[in-house]
């Protein structure tokens, strides 16, 4: 069974998948479609790196540009380094600028919805 066939079988169970499962899935060549990706739990998507999302979505990663104003895509973009976003070749903007340090202050983030940044 290839990655795409595997994805079809598990698609209906993915809604509540934790980050760890999504990271594991990104190694399986599943090419998750964007509609399924956007139904995932936001808190599970946010910790994923650009490389992991690229592997998870495969060719469908291109659709992030078309859906950049919708959650969880919008929130995920805000969490990524701009340099990493640039590798997607989509012209996505809003990532963390080069030279900034991300502080994982979960209370601050829970209140504001955005990560806390320290300038260069």
């Amino acid at each position: 069974m290839n990655g795409s066939e595997y994805f079809v079988k598990i698609q209906s169970f993915l809604g509540g998948a934790p980050t760890e499962d999504l990271k594991a899935l990104s190694q399986q060549n599943v090419s998750m479609d964007l509609a399924t990706f956007m139904k995932l739990r936001t808190d599970a998507v946010l910790p994923l790196t650009v490389a992991e999302v690229q592997k998870l979505l495969g060719p469908h990663v291109e659709g992030l540009k078309a859906e950049e104003r919708h959650r969880p895509v919008r929130d995920w973009i805000l969490r990524q380094r701009q340099d990493d976003l640039d590798t997607l070749g989509l012209g996505l903007q809003g990532g963390i600028p080069n030279g900034y340090l991300v502080l994982d202050l979960s209370m601050q983030e829970a209140l504001s919805g955005t990560p806390c940044l320290l300038g260069p």
Partner: antibody, heavy 117, light 113 residues
């Protein structure tokens, strides 16, 4: 003004390979993916695959997986599509098309590839 | 693969009259989160490359005349030309961009009656 200029028509023998180029201008080359679509004479459109011009990552329609290779040259804002082991049914017009998000917003003029012994 | 079925295969319409083209997909093209339908319409005039008319099922591409409109959701979609002009003679294709391989309908040829 966005422009996609493709290489000229080719005539190839069965079993040979063909490499079609698509030179882009009028926009930031690394901000938009490029797709390849073909159209056999008098027939409809068939998606072959797409490529991320920033990283060079490419994805192919499984129908062509073993025979197609898409590459990019950022220095000249050019993408390439190579199709190997050509057969007569590969005779078609091959188009490059720039993505607008997922849809194909701009198309090249097309390159006719004729496969004949 | 998602199968796209267009109807009719060809259509002859008088100048100034309405032309309606249907496109049906074998599975939903709706993103239930964003409410976007991943369907595009293209026009291909004789001897030319295709051009984009509509994306997200109903969003008209910049520069496309407002006589062209797209509608539908899920699996059933329609392209309407409200008042056919001579320059609209072409083949029209729908395409899904929900899941690879992105697939096209077989095309509908629109002619003047």
């Amino acid at each position: 003004e966005v422009q996609l200029v493709q290489s000229g028509a080719e005539v190839k023998k069965p079993g040979a390979s063909v490499k079609v180029s698509c030179k882009a201008s009028g926009y930031t080359f690394t901000n938009y993916w490029m797709h390849w679509v073909r159209q056999a004479p008098g027939q409809g459109l068939e998606w072959m695959g797409n490529i991320n011009p920033s990283s060079g990552d490419s994805y192919y329609n499984e129908r062509f997986m073993s025979r197609v290779t898409m590459t990019v040259d950022k220095s000249t804002s050019t993408v390439y599509m190579e199709l190997s082991s050509l057969r007569s049914e590969d005779t078609a017009v091959y188009y490059c098309a720039r993505s607008g998000g997922l849809w194909l917003a701009f198309w090249g003029q097309g390159t006719l590839v004729t496969v004949s012994s | 693969d998602i199968v796209m079925t267009q109807s009719p295969d060809s259509l002859a319409v008088s100048l100034g009259e309405r032309a309606t083209i249907n496109c049906k997909s074998s599975q939903t093209l709706l993103n239930s989160v964003s409410q976007n339908n991943y369907l595009a319409w293209y026009q291909q005039k004789p001897g030319q490359s295709p051009t984009l008319l509509i994306y997200f099922a109903s969003t008209r591409e910049s520069g496309v005349p407002d006589r062209f409109s797209g509608s539908g959701s899920g699996t059933d979609f329609t392209l309407t030309i409200s008042s056919l002009q001579a320059e609209d003679v072409a083949v029209y294709y729908c395409q899904q961009h929900y899941r690879t391989p992105y697939t096209f309908g077989g095309g509908t040829k629109v002619e003047i009656k």
